[in-house]
Amino acid sequence: GSGIFQLRLQEFVNQRGMLANGQSCEPGCRTFFRICLKHFQATFSEGPCTFGNVSTPVLGTNSFVVRDKNSGSGRNPLQLPFNFTWPGTFSLNIQAWHTPGDDLRPETSPGNSLISQIIIQGSLAVGKIWRTDEQNDTLTRLSYSYRVICSDNYYGESCSRLCKKRDDHFGHYECQPDGSLSCLPGWTGKYCDQPICLSGCHEQNGYCSKPDECICRPGWQGRLCNECIPHNGCRHGTCSIPWQCACDEGWGGLFCDQDLNYCTHHSPCKNGSTCSNSGPKGYTCTCLPGYTGEHCELGLSKCASNPCRNGGSCKDQENSYHCLCPPGYYGQHCEHSTLTCADSPCFNGGSCRERNQGSSYACECPPNFTGSNCEKKVDRCTSNPCANGGQCQNRGPSRTCRCRPGFTGTHCELHISDCARSPCAHGGTCHDLENGPVCTCPAGFSGRRCEVRITHDACASGPCFNGATCYTGLSPNNFVCNCPYGFVGSRCEFPVGLPPSFPWVA
């Protein structure tokens, strides 16, 4: 602890100018004071001034008032500092002396004489309020005040509490009258060393090193550090914890950068076709009749199906076609003839047969010729009869398929290593695929090798359209529609002028 006992001398009266021994001072009592402060004693005794002592210079002669200011080199109030916890009790001895010598340092002068003394014993609490008193004896009167205050940075009832205001990283505070800390704005904690972060700053995910700050811990962002940072590279995703990438609807992959809903996001299918998603960035366009291409962007020629008969030439029109008929023919498709056998309409040695009582005719063509007037030479390779990349070659009235290595059969349809062993039972047709032979079974049989006889015939309900052939046997109770030229789909329900690569499995 640390404090100061302060004594303010206010007025001293010695009207007769007398000493304690009854003698008078000549020419007057030149008065100074000695003060002794010590621990409380019920009976004041001589001995060391345990709490301190002080002397004044000469303050006046006989009777005088002491002003609240420095008097010579002395001070009023007088200061008696102590470096211990104030006990709350004390004993005080104030002596008035006459000196014939030095005004400033009368203590050192010989021949000093006692004028009077007073003794005060009691209790005194620390505080700013002065306690005023007056002591009389037969010759003198002394008016004075005293108090105990704490030294700078000491607080509390006994000046035992040390507190120094500070504003550094070990504390940001001022001191209350009782010595407790009063945090500066923006700081908290026992020592006011903890900053108060920006209001709303997330308790776990954010922190601060000075007030009204919010510094985010790794994985968090935003003004209040309450937004997680998704995985680096996350494109179409969010997070609920740091480094996560939870994909938005329609997106997939580690970085949510794979489009699972390509149809909706990009609308790739044209001309009213139907789009079906099929995995990341995958889709299939199902074209309306009359369109083809990956995106159904190509309009099929209305003449693609060769609708004009009897050598009529076909012209595309906006939504249809028009047949220009050769001489002797008429009708939408040039299907009606104005010719008769008399007009020798059959070419290349074709035989003419009259029909409808001579109003029309039919030509019977010799080998290698076809057409309603035997006008076309048969090219047996136009139907692309050779499978698995086989090369078609015309050989007079017939044609042959020249197969690639590893394939055989009239149409190169057999993989030598797989179908050569005739693995399909009950007349099943063998198809060579990358993963081995697959059997297309006739009605009434199923199983990988058509070995299972089935009672329920999946083809019985006639599921295949447009004259397609129905097979069972790829797996139990399934059926296969083998589409004719110009149709595709699981039931051969879509007309497209392209050959199917393999039968569709329903």
């Epitope: 120094k164 500070r166 550094d168 990283h169 070990f170 060393d193 090193s209």
Partner: antibody, heavy 121, light 104 residues
Framework: EVQLQESGPGLVKPSETLSLTCTVS??????????WGWIRQPPGKGLEWIGD???????YYNPSLKSRVTISVDTSKNQFSLKLSSVTAADTAVYYC??????FGGGADSWGQGTLVTVSS | SYELTQPPSVSVSPGQTASITCSGD??????VSWYQQKPGQSPVLVIY???TRPSGIPERFSGSNSGDTATLTISGTQPMDEADYYC?????????FGSGTKVT
């Protein structure tokens, strides 16, 4: 009881960077009650405060060394580190790491045993 | 920059009182710590916040601080107290050590 241990090369060439690490055991470096400081003492001379760091990463440096000093903390390893760049022979000293207690008004109540770093080519 | 000044040396007889001063502008308004360092050893905190002893420090060590001067007092000095003593204070956000006093 907390213990501090300095580690790093004992010899550094002039103009290079001095790097030291202090490993704290027996206590958490993430405690809000302490700062973690570096103090050095040239041979036969007095102590010089270099700087300190809080577990959040807030740093405070001696103004005379500030342009060359970097102190960092790795709470996962319970370590803090000192880097002093562009060293000269005047940086030759015993380097101490210490724990400065908020409750002791900043007094350093625990010290490492010190490591001598010599700057010489 | 802030400076703390200490006498280079203080001599004392065993059993007597040694007083080491540390002066700096307005030092009484700052908290002062005192460290003891023996040859070849790390410093040890003996006084913090002007006058408080950490646990394990003998009662013969005491401190005071007012005005521009802080004082470390060793009452009944023992031979084992022979060491260098450093005062330290904080100036704003920076730590400052005194120049050190050798007590023999």
């Amino acid at each position: 009881e907390v213990q501090l241990q300095e580690s790093g090369p004992g010899l550094v060439k002039p103009s290079e960077t001095l790097s030291l690490t202090c490993t704290v055991s027996g206590g958490s470096i993430s405690s809000s009650n302490y700062y973690w400081g570096w103090i050095r003492q040239p041979p036969g001379k007095g102590l010089e405060w270099i700087g300190d760091i809080y577990y959040t990463g807030s740093t405070y440096y001696n103004p005379s060394l500030k342009s060359r000093v970097t102190i960092s903390v790795d709470t996962s390893k319970n370590q803090f580190s000192l880097k002093l760049s562009s060293v000269t022979a005047a940086d030759t000293a015993v380097y101490y790491c210490a724990r400065e207690a908020v409750s002791f008004g900043g007094g350093a109540d625990s010290w490492g045993q010190g490591t001598l770093v010599t700057v010489s080519s | 920059s802030y400076e703390l000044t200490q006498p280079p040396s203080v001599s004392v007889s065993p059993g007597q009182t040694a007083s080491i001063t540390c002066s700096g502008d307005g030092l009484g308004d700052k908290y002062v710590s005192w460290y003891q360092q023996k040859p070849g050893q790390s410093p040890v905190l003996v006084i913090y916040e002007d006058s408080t002893r950490p646990s394990g420090i003998p009662e013969r060590f005491s401190g005071s601080n007012s005005g521009d001067t802080a004082t470390l007092t060793i009452s009944g000095t023992q031979p084992m107290d022979e060491a260098d003593y450093y005062c330290q204070a904080w100036d704003s956000e920076s730590g400052v050590f005194g120049s050190g006093t050798k007590v023999t």
